[in-house]
């Protein structure tokens, strides 16, 4: 059976004056030599020899300083041999327990502490946490930390509360105000021994976070300016506000706006973001003729909200603006800006000189009637197909054109004329837009099957031909209507949607012919002027081959009679 | 469980300055050990050069006090060596080794040893 | 030079005694514990015996060693080939600090 005792050891001292400071003895020593050994963590593992055994007495001594911080506690393992080196008894793990000395200081988490708080909080509003802990035995005085504030910056009224056990940073007060400081710096002690023992400090940094809670406020009692009439203005005037928010942020930020006078919409405000100043704009030209001055009411507010504390006291205040029209003799000008004539249709774009479109006259804005004393001359004139006349202000064409000119764009020619005071100087520019038709340059061609036929049998097929695609079948062949005097020779029969057969009507004597045709596509565009085809008709062989000619002089007719020679 | 591994930049040369560094994983050098720097010459014996507890008191190689510097870098739980003005006899593997040293009681001799080595680097001294 | 003095090389065949002596002087080994570590080639050292004469958990029993004054000694009985390596005695000197023994080298032979 073991006897046994262990004595509790302080760390940090010497404990050798208590040696031993545990004793294992068993009673098999009355009747044997007993040898003792001892094991375990402090004697033969790391750290290595802290204990010894007097192998005979079972005397354990310490040999050196423990820390409890490293070792709470030492188990050592006991056993009792016999001279033959076997054990007599159970080995026996004694428990040293290692006596803590408030030999730690608290240790923070952080040596500077980061938070925040809005402005104007509620008092008792959790600011932060700090943390701190101590390596010293837990759940004892010697690791109990007490935390208490020991300076403010900026000093003055205590503006925080610091919870002793907990750690916790609140607000002692509603009136933290960001205008009066923007941040606060506390010096704060974590002491162990619930406040009595080892202390150690840092820092805790609170931003105050800003609100808004303070109205922009125009800097004058009223504003004025003058501006000319028919201007516009990018920077009329410029209001200056205080706000004591934060600056650039959207507490801080104006926002400017009409109370009442800008119902026509002449002016905007706009925010310079760097200096928060107000810009008046002149947006729409002022009339003088209609308002001789204008008086706006602004006023400003935030870009964000207000807050709680202070929108119930938010009123609009209104500032007055007074803006003086300047009358500016205005001259003359074309109203509307641009005109647009069209040429009627079936005109053809070789007869188009001396056609008049019509007039185009400026007028005098202060009289709103059509000016006098003005000269008028073509400015930008593409291709030079038109002309002005200099005091009526008519406008006609002075050149024919081909219908493929490259100055017809979407069938439209456009063209500037100007408007000269004689007076001042001053020009003012309308724009011309003259619509022309299809033009039926391009019309189709008729194309005969052959050039001769016999004249025993005169019948050719005609074909239309079209160069562009302005024009689309089926196609309508028509004679031109010949001369009342003379009788009908031929006659056209329609065969499909391109092609016609040309016949006499009778037999016909050998000779040239030339014959007017009209075709006419679906859309009832027709040329201008008939096409001509040229068909001889000549003495055939029994084989059907044009033979001898027509006497050379035998008078031709015009209109499907032999033409006089080839 | 802590491990030590020592770093540094390679040969050195004459009468520069040697740095090296020891890192300790698995544990915190703010434990209870004295952080020691022991160097063995090519194919001759340990030469303890000196060790640092956290708190930065030290214990220095007398022979080469005037040469060497040892510090502890807490936050990066690592300590490094310094030693100016090498010769090539100071051509070695440079071991970082954990340490226990407890002043004994009266009557009791001092404690002095090292439990854990890191594997060691070799600097050699040449132009 | 080295303040604890070895003898530079020892060795013995498999099964044999060999014992390692370690000399120095009043401040250190006098005064103060010794320690004994063993470096296999290529290694770091390992500690072997601390407090003059105890072995850490793990070290076999072959391995004993013992202090008188200012000595001290390494004893290795029945030898093996997995303990060629070589062995240093350490201790702290109270005027110089750390100190170790020159190193010896174990040959085992045959």
């Known amino acids: 059976e073991w006897v046994k005792f262990a004595k509790p050891c302080r760390e940090g001292e010497d404990n050798s004056k208590r040696n031993p400071i545990a004793k294992i003895t068993s009673d098999y020593q009355a009747t044997q030599k007993i040898t003792y050994r001892i094991s375990g963590v402090g004697i033969d593992q790391p750290p290595f020899g802290i204990f010894v055994v007097d192998k005979n007495t079972g005397d354990i001594n310490i040999t050196a300083i423990v820390d409890r911080e490293e070792t709470p506690s030492f188990l050592i393992t006991c056993r009792a041999l016999n001279a033959q080196g076997l054990d007599v008894e159970k080995p026996l793990i004694l428990t040293v327990k290692i006596l803590d000395i408030n030999d730690n200081p608290p240790v923070f988490s952080q040596q500077i502490f980061m938070g925040e708080i809005e402005e104007n909080s509620a008092s008792n509003s959790l600011v932060m946490i700090l943390n701190a802990t101590d390596a010293d035995e837990p759940n004892h005085l010697n690791s109990k930390i007490a935390f208490k504030i020991v300076s403010q910056e900026p000093a003055g009224t205590p503006m925080f509360l610091l919870s002793r056990n907990t750690g916790e940073v609140r607000t002692l007060t509603n009136s933290l105000d960001r205008e009066q400081a923007s941040s606060y710096r506390l010096v704060v002690s974590g002491a162990d021994k619930d406040g009595e023992g080892l202390s150690t400090q840092c820092e805790c940094n609170i931003k105050v976070k800003d609100v808004n809670d303070n109205f922009p406020m125009f800097r004058d009692s009223q504003y004025s300016a003058r501006i000319e009439e028919n201007i516009l203005s990018s920077e009329l005037l410029r209001f200056q506000v205080t706000d004591l928010d934060e600056e650039y942020t959207d507490n801080w930020l104006a926002v400017y706006f009409f109370t009442s006078g800008n119902e026509g919409n002449w002016f905007e405000i706009q925010t310079d973001p760097r200096t928060n100043e107000g810009i008046l704009k002149v947006v729409k030209a002022l009339d003088y003729e209609q308002l001789q001055s204008v008086k706006l009411s602004i006023a400003v507010k935030n870009k964000a909200e207000f807050h709680q504390s202070v929108i119930s006291r938010y009123r609009v205040q209104s500032t007055p603006v007074t803006i003086q029209v300047i009358n500016v003799r205005e001259g003359i000008a074309f109203r509307p800006a641009s005109k647009t004539f069209t040429v009627q249709k079936g005109i053809s774009s070789k007869k188009l000189v001396d056609y008049i479109l019509g007039t185009y006259q400026a007028i005098d804005e202060d009289t709103n009637k059509a000016a006098s004393n003005v000269k008028y001359v073509m400015g930008r004139n593409d291709g030079g197909y038109l002309m002005i006349d200099s005091k009526t202000a008519e406008i006609k064409f002075v050149k024919n054109m081909n219908r493929d000119s490259t100055f017809i764009v979407n069938k439209t020619i456009t063209a500037e004329v100007l408007a000269i005071d004689e007076y001042t100087g001053k020009t003012s520019t309308g724009t011309v837009y003259v619509r022309v038709p299809d033009f039926n340059d391009n019309c189709p061609t008729a194309v005969l099957e052959k050039d001769a036929v016999c004249s025993s049998s005169p019948s050719v097929v005609v074909s239309a031909r079209t160069l562009n695609n302005r024009y689309t079948g089926p196609y309508t062949f028509a004679l031109e209507d010949q001369p009342v005097k003379l009788p009908a020779v031929w006659s056209i029969t329609t065969l499909n949607a391109t092609s016609a057969l040309l016949r006499a009507q009778e037999q016909i004597p050998p000779g040239v012919y030339h014959i007017s045709l009209v075709l006419t596509d679906s859309q009832n565009n027709r040329c201008e002027m008939p096409r001509s085809l040229t068909l001889e008709v000549c003495q055939c062989d029994n084989r059907g081959i044009c033979g001898t000619s027509y006497p050379t002089t035998s008078p031709g007719t015009r209109y499907g009679r032999p033409h006089s020679g080839r | 469980q802590v491990q030590l591994q020592e770093s540094g930049p390679g040969p050195v040369k004459p009468s520069g300055t040697l740095s090296l560094t020891c890192g300790v994983s698995?544990?915190?050098?703010?434990?209870?050990?004295?952080w020691t720097w022991v160097r063995q010459p090519p194919g001759k014996g340990l030469e303890w050069i000196g060790e640092?507890?956290?708190?930065?008191?030290?214990f220095l190689n007398p022979s080469l006090k005037s040469r060497v510097t040892i510090s502890v870098d807490k936050s990066n739980n690592q300590f490094s060596l310094k030693l100016t003005s090498v010769t090539a006899a100071d051509t070695a593997v440079y071991y970082c080794?954990?340490?226990?040293?407890?002043?004994?009681?009266?009557?009791?001799?001092?404690?002095?040893?090292?439990?854990?080595w890191g594997r060691g680097t070799l600097v050699s001294v040449s132009s | 030079q080295s303040v604890l003095t070895q003898p530079p090389s020892v060795s013995g065949t498999p099964g044999q005694r060999v014992t390692i002596s370690c000399s120095g002087s009043?401040?250190?080994?006098?005064?103060?514990?010794v320690y004994w570590y063993q470096q296999l080639p290529g290694t770091a050292p390992k500690i072997l015996i601390y407090s003059n004469d105890q072995r850490p958990a793990g070290v076999p029993d072959r391995f004993s060693a013992s202090k008188s004054g200012t000595s001290a000694s390494l004893a290795i009985s029945g030898l093996r080939s997995e303990d060629e390596a070589d062995y240093y005695c350490a201790a702290w000197d109270d005027g110089q600090g750390g100190v170790f023994g020159g190193g010896t080298k174990l040959t085992v032979l045959g």
């Open positions: 640092i507890y956290h708190n930065g008191s030290t």
């Open positions: 009043s401040s250190h080994i006098g005064s103060n514990y």
């Open positions: 080794a954990r340490g226990w040293h407890r002043t004994g009681f009266r009557g009791y001799p001092s404690h002095w040893y090292f439990d854990l």
């Open positions: 698995g544990g915190s050098i703010s434990s209870n050990h004295w």
